[in-house]
């Protein structure tokens, strides 16, 4: 059962994990969430009657009934773990604690003129986990404007304390805003041989980057493979830093692959949801349960199901024994991972898929593509979204993109005579325009914010959102694409496709079926070669073929540039201008998504 | 509701500089531009410049050396300072709200005529 | 500059008759965007100008169905097509794709 609401004046009594520090009760809930076993937490608030020493602890807690007796305790406020819900979760932080201290290993001092600043020095050094700030009331003059960059260990606080004019908060590195490189590749035959911090058992090497990449300290890993000759060290994922916050000494060793934490681009490729099956993979732990069940997809539901399993493994049915049911073996342990992986035993294994909600909605895979072809068909592109006006009759006006539950990414060119959003409907999940009727159902929209600098799509800027009045319930027909990570910003995309309903020519009339082109994107020097009158800047993005052919035209602005990359589907641009349409050596213009990411998140995370 | 109004002196000496305010309510400047549209008696309209809503200026190639167009964001208006008047200079001023984007002119203030003469 | 030409400099017309006005560019106005920005406004006499139509065709909320827009890169025809005594006025077409904007000289419609 899902609880949201947090107790107050309340403490559970009993199932300590272990202690943390944290500046509020939410943030401890956070905390508490993304912990692999804890259920349940209290929190101590500052308060008179309290110790200060317990003021800001948050004690993490675990129990096999999934609750704990409520004891009533001034200044104590208790909740429950996010894992119960099934709504998407996120460990950003935005906020700014004022008059706290976030005690932790200060490694980096600087002058800074705003604790913004401050936050932005943290979001973009590989180490910082949280910061404090000195603001320029705080009495010791040669602490003023101080800027204390800080890590620990479990990537909370040490110790909270109350200190007059300082403020802190924490990294913005889980709210996509880091400008950090994302670097996804992963070395085979390589081992960094660096300090460990950790490690723990892995089936692959995916899972243990993903791992580090949800570890606090980690900032890249080797893992070990079954192959690997020292038996003992099968499977292992080593857990790495150092202070350079790069791989200080890279050894060529066999059957061992290195990687890097994916922290940088975690908002646009799955960090937490192991989603595949392993064959022949016995995961050894904690056993919570054993349940019969038809198959090992069955098996994963259950322990998805089961709010503390963690792993699985399977064993299928010997011949017609039991109704052709396996056994499901639901098991968990204290860090999430197997105590041990033995192979050759027949199983099957995997892991809950209860952690993929912490994954952004946008990195779930959708069904195989059909290539080939200019129709698409129903489901291939399920954030691409149709946008009508109702005045002074109704049309498609522009494509757009569902970038999150609530919000349409698309063109602020599209909006030209449009003067409320009253006029407006988004319909998702359509693949013919005949398929809109009276009754269709559609979302409303509560508010156009185009970009301030918009004047003109030549000119760049031609970049807006949309507000829907209700919510979008994601399925396999309408769900949203990934932004791209800043950190990707090198990353050279060699699977893109432009989508929409517009012309197939440049004298033509709105297509019915949803059409798509694969087209390759052009360097912006290229670019700009094609069109000399402008100025092609770095916030603009082009594609086409040298020799034409293939293009976007009338009525798909606003519409995705969808890349594949990593088995991931990302913005990477908005359908904005051209000269013509598919013209010779013309290519199209898009809006870059990637540089428009932080105004993005800016206008859809405002309060 | 929006409203624009044009205010200013009636008669200008010539070669002096004209300075005339448009004052508006109902929205703000930094979400929507504001253009400057004159007409002389009796002819047609002119497009003389806009105040974009992110604080740029573009201008009418005609009179862009001797116009300047600025803001005030806090009193809501818009400036429009135009120098080395002429009597052919001598027309009615209107400001006017762009729509969501650049145009269309939903919305135009009633005009204020300017007199060039000595 | 972006010259557009209108024609006839003026009408007369009864009521209930159909009108075409003529508005001709010196370039095309088809941006790149896919958008062209050609508008139409009515100027009553003793009034401020009103918006008719943008996007060549595209008739904001209250103007009646009896106004209609046609054309496309640098030829354009507004067309009443039975006039009433409250269209009486002048008729300028603007253009908003290339900077700086323009107007069209303004064709003034009248009873005779």
């Known amino acids: 059962e899902c609880v949201t609401q947090l107790l107050k004046d309340t403490c559970f009594e009993g199932g300590d994990i272990t202690t943390v520090f944290t500046p509020s009760a939410k943030y401890c809930q956070v905390v508490c969430t993304y912990h692999p076993r804890c259920l349940l937490f209290t929190f101590t608030a500052e308060s008179p009657s309290e110790d200060p020493t317990r003021w800001f602890t948050c004690v993490l807690k675990d129990s096999v009934t999934e609750t704990l007796p409520r004891v009533n305790r001034t200044a104590a406020i208790s909740g429950y773990s996010f894992k119960q819900c099934s709504h998407q979760i996120s460990a950003c932080n935005k906020d700014i604690y004022v008059d706290l201290d976030m005690k932790g290993i200060n490694y980096n001092s600087s002058v800074a003129k705003s604790a913004q600043e401050c936050q932005e020095r943290c979001t973009d050094d590989v180490h910082c986990h949280f910061f404090t700030y000195a603001t320029r009331q705080f009495p010791s003059l040669e602490h003023r404007n101080i800027c204390l960059l800080k890590h620990t260990q479990t990537g909370t606080p040490t110790r909270i304390t109350k200190l007059d004019k300082v403020v802190s908060g924490f990294s913005l590195k889980s709210c996509a805003l880091s400008n950090l490189a994302c670097i996804r590749d992963i070395f085979p035959n390589t081992v960094f041989a660096d300090s460990n911090i950790d490690s723990v058992m892995a089936p692959d090497a995916f899972v243990c980057g993903r791992i580090c990449t949800h570890h606090p300290g980690c900032l890249f890993f080797t893992f070990f493979s079954q192959e690997w000759p020292k038996e003992s060290q099968r499977n292992l994922c080593l857990l790495k830093t150092s202070e350079s916050g790069l791989p200080s000494t890279r050894i060529k060793k066999s059957k061992a692959l290195s990687g890097f934490s994916l922290q940088s681009c975690r908002h646009s490729i799955p960090v937490f949801c192991h989603s595949s099956f392993y064959h022949d993979t016995d995961f050894l732990g904690e056993e919570l349960d054993i349940v019969a069940a038809k198959s090992h997809e069955a098996c994963q539901k259950l322990c998805t199901n089961a709010v503390r399993c963690q792993f699985f493994t399977y064993t299928p049915a010997q011949a017609s024994c039991n109704e052709g049911k396996g056994k499901c073996y639901l098991k968990l342990s204290s860090n999430g991972s197997p105590t041990k992986i033995l192979h050759g035993r027949g199983g099957i294994s995997g892991y809950t898929l209860r952690l993929c909600k912490m994954d952004n909605e946008c990195t779930t895979k959708i069904k195989p593509r059909i290539v080939g072809g200019t129709a698409s068909v129903r489901g291939e592109w399920p954030w691409q979204v149709t946008l009508h006006t109702t005045s002074p009759t109704q049309r498609h006006l522009c494509g757009g993109s569902i970038i999150g539950n609530q919000w349409i990414l698309t063109a602020a060119h599209c909006f030209y005579g449009v003067e409320s959003p009253k006029i407006l409907r988004v319909y998702s999940g359509i693949l013919n325009q005949s398929e809109i009727k009276e009754d269709t159902s559609f979302f409303g929209v509560q508010e156009i914010i185009i970009h301030d600098q918009y004047k003109m799509a030549e000119s760049g800027y031609d970049i807006a959102l949309l507000k829907l009045e209700t919510t979008v319930n994601y399925t396999d027909s309408q769900r949203p694409i990934c932004l791209p990570s800043k950190g990707d910003r090198n990353v050279i995309y060699t699977d893109c496709w432009v989508t929409g309903w517009g012309y197939r020519k440049l004298r033509d009339k709105i297509q019915n079926t949803l059409q798509k082109a694969k087209i390759p994107l052009v360097t912006n020097e290229e670019c700009q070669k094609r069109y000399r009158g402008h100025k092609i800047t770095h916030k603009m993005i082009c594609a086409g073929y040298r020799e034409g052919g293939k293009d976007a035209c009338k009525g798909d602005s606003g519409g995705p540039l969808s890349c594949k990359h990593n088995e991931v589907w990302h913005l990477v641009g908005i359908t904005s201008w051209g000269e013509g349409c598919a013209q010779r050596e013309r290519p199209g213009v898009y809006t870059n998504v990637v540089e428009y990411v932080d105004w993005i998140l800016e206008k859809t995370q405002a309060v | 509701q929006v409203q624009l109004k044009e205010s200013g002196p009636g008669l200008v000496q010539p070669s002096q500089t004209l300075s005339l305010t448009c004052t508006v309510s109902?929205?703000?400047?930094?979400?929507?531009?504001v253009h400057w549209v004159r007409q002389p008696p009796g002819k047609g309209l002119e497009w003389m410049g806009i105040?974009?809503?992110?604080?740029?200026?573009s201008y009418n190639s005609v009179l862009k050396s001797r116009l300047s167009i600025s803001r005030d964001i806090s009193k809501s208006q818009v400036f429009l300072k135009m120098s080395s008047l002429q009597t052919e200079d001598t027309a009615t001023y209107f400001c006017?709200?762009?729509?969501?984007?650049?145009?269309?002119?939903?919305?135009w203030g009633q005009g204020t005529l300017v007199t060039v003469s000595s | 500059d972006v010259v557009l030409t209108q024609t006839p400099g003026s009408l007369s017309v009864t009521l209930g008759q159909q009108v075409s006005i003529s508005c001709r560019s010196s370039?095309?106005?088809?941006?790149?965007?896919?958008?062209?920005?050609l508008e139409w406004y009515l100027q009553k006499p003793g009034q401020s100008p009103q918006v008719l139509l943008y996007?060549?065709?595209n008739r904001l909320s209250g103007v009646p169905d009896r106004f209609l827009g046609r054309g496309s890169g640098a030829d354009f025809t507004l067309k009443i097509s039975r006039v009433e005594p409250e269209d009486l006025g002048v008729y300028y077409c603007?253009?908003?794709?290339?900077?700086?904007?323009?107007f069209g000289s303004g064709t003034k419609l009248e009873m005779k």
């Open positions: 370039q095309s106005l088809e941006s790149r965007d896919g958008n062209t920005y």
């Open positions: 109902g929205f703000s400047l930094t979400t929507y531009h």
């Open positions: 105040m974009w809503r992110d604080g740029d200026t």
């Open positions: 996007g060549v065709s």
């Open positions: 603007f253009q908003a794709t290339h900077g700086p904007f323009t």
């Open positions: 006017a709200r762009g729509g969501t984007l650049t145009t269309p002119f939903t919305y």
